[in-house]
């Protein structure tokens, strides 16, 4: 019995179906086919879970969180024992193993390994201003998404004809911050943060209203 090489890993957007491949060759009839799919979740590597089981001509559910979402892609028994996972969740990320036994065929490689990574687009980021909006001050524009896998990068732009940040601005696209030093009237305007990763983008907006000191009325 020989389980074929799997592609190293599969990436899928959260909520989309994933197919985890596993095929094998065997010299024996498929009368005593026994297939166990296991997962070692990334979130809990010490706690392997059963995903689905085929034994004695019957299918059995694995861990409760997979109930109703997992099945074999084809009619069993077969030499293609790939599975699908519907409505993928972040917690489905992990290393999946198919363990195949088909007595009396023994020997050879009976395990296939595939990694599954569930990707999440950036959630709508939260934009904030740190510091005083008085003219001459330094301000920090903050942007962060609560969700996003892979981790989003953040690009700030000023929403006007140029889309350029003021010349006194420095940007950190990893942290999602922009520091604008010595703000002036020309710093005022709408600033948009675009949070991006491999599968999506999301935006938020700030209205920077730089305030000049008001002349005092002298009684």
């Amino acid at each position: 019995l020989e389980v074929s090489e799997s592609p190293g890993s599969i990436q899928v957007a959260r909520g989309q179906p994933a197919v985890l491949p596993c095929t094998f060759t065997t010299s024996a009839a498929l009368i005593n086919l026994n297939v166990i799919w296991m997962v070692t979740p990334l979130s809990n590597a010490n706690q392997p879970e059963q995903v689905i089981l085929y034994q004695g001509g019957q299918m059995f559910d694995g861990a409760p969180r997979f109930h109703g979402r997992v099945g074999f892609t084809g009619t069993m028994p077969a030499t293609n024992v790939s599975i699908f996972i519907n409505n993928t969740q972040l917690s489905d990320t992990g290393t999946y193993q198919c363990l195949v036994n088909n007595l009396p065929d023994i020997g050879g490689r009976n395990i296939g390994v595939t990694g599954l990574t569930v990707l999440v687009p950036p959630s709508a980021p939260h934009c904030q201003i740190q510091g005083s909006q008085d003219i001459g001050s330094d301000v920090i524009l903050l942007c962060s998404s609560e969700e996003g896998i892979p981790r989003p990068t953040y690009l700030w732009e000023k929403l006007d004809n140029t889309l350029k940040l003021p010349p006194t601005a420095t940007q950190d696209q990893v942290q999602g911050t922009v520091t604008i030093r010595n703000i002036s009237a020309l710093s005022s305007g709408l600033y948009q943060c675009v949070a991006s990763n491999a599968i999506g983008t999301s935006t938020c907006l700030l209205d920077l209203q730089v305030i000049s000191p008001q002349p005092r009325n002298i009684g």
Epitope: Q128, Q192, C204, L205, D207, Q209, V210, Q214
Partner: antibody, heavy 120, light 106 residues
Framework: EVKLVESGGGLVQPGGSLKLSCAAS????????MSWVRQTPEKRLEWVAY????????YYPDTVKGRFTISRDNAKNTLYLQMSSLKSEDTAMYYC?????????????WGQGTLVTVSA | QIVLSQSPAILSASPGEKVTMTCRAS?????IHWYQQKPGSSPKPWIY???NLASGVPARFSGSGSGTSYSLTISRVEAEDAATYYC????????TFASGTKLEIK
């Protein structure tokens, strides 16, 4: 008391131009971003232009970009909207709106509006 | 562009009832604003940044939500609440409004 009074609306032919004004009082005009928002006869609200408090930054939706120009005169406490190449779909009540304090853009005060009708 | 949908389009309630109207966005947005408009008047700011009541808005109003789903709730409706309520987003240009929920008092 914050007060915004729009003027300049009226009947104009398709392809024509019109300039709206908004006189502001009761607050420090130069400290606040301003916008124009319109409401169609079907009661749909549409944001049409934004200008920063200093006047150096403007922004528009694609539907009016290149046809409408927002400006302000902080010395006169007045906001303007120059509209050109007008289309029938520009027919609406036009409101001048002052943005709120803080950094969330939102329309904290609205004027009573001025009606623009584009028709042959 | 982000499309905002409000439901229901028309909401009928008796004084004292609790009512909730929803605003759904076609993509995730960071916050929503709500405006109230009565016939013949200009819109008034009602709730800003999802949950903050604008000045003068009664405490029976509240706002909540995140991502693509937001709501405005009135704990005990009064006759003066009859109006059309619009939600609006500033996350992405164009800064769109929904078509509104008209609240009628029986």
């Amino acid at each position: 008391e914050v007060k915004l009074v729009e003027s300049g609306g009226g009947l104009v032919q398709p392809g024509g131009s019109l300039k709206l004004s908004c006189a502001a009082s009761g607050f420090t005009f130069s400290s606040y971003s301003m916008s124009w928002v319109r409401q169609t006869p079907e009661k749909r609200l549409e944001w049409v232009a934004y200008i920063s408090n200093g006047g150096g930054s403007t922004y528009y939706p694609d539907t009016v970009k290149g046809r409408f120009t927002i400006s302000r005169d902080n010395a006169k406490n007045t906001l303007y909207l120059q509209m050109s190449s007008l289309k029938s779909e520009d027919t609406a009540m036009y409101y001048c709106a002052r943005h709120g304090d803080g950094y969330y853009p939102w329309f904290a005060y609205w004027g009573q509006g001025t009606l623009v009708t584009v028709s042959a | 562009q982000i499309v905002l949908s409000q439901s229901p389009a028309i909401l009928s309630a008796s004084p004292g009832e609790k009512v909730t109207m929803t605003c759904r966005a076609s993509s995730s947005v960071s916050y929503i604003h709500w405006y109230q408009q009565k016939p013949g008047s200009s819109p008034k700011p009602w709730i800003y940044a999802t949950s903050n009541l604008a000045s003068g808005v009664p405490a029976r109003f509240s706002g909540s939500g995140s991502g693509t789903s937001y709501s405005l709730t009135i704990s005990r409706v009064e006759a003066e609440d009859a109006a059309t309520y619009y939600c609006q987003q500033w996350s992405s240009n164009p800064f769109t409004f929904a078509s509104g929920t008209k609240l009628e008092i029986k």
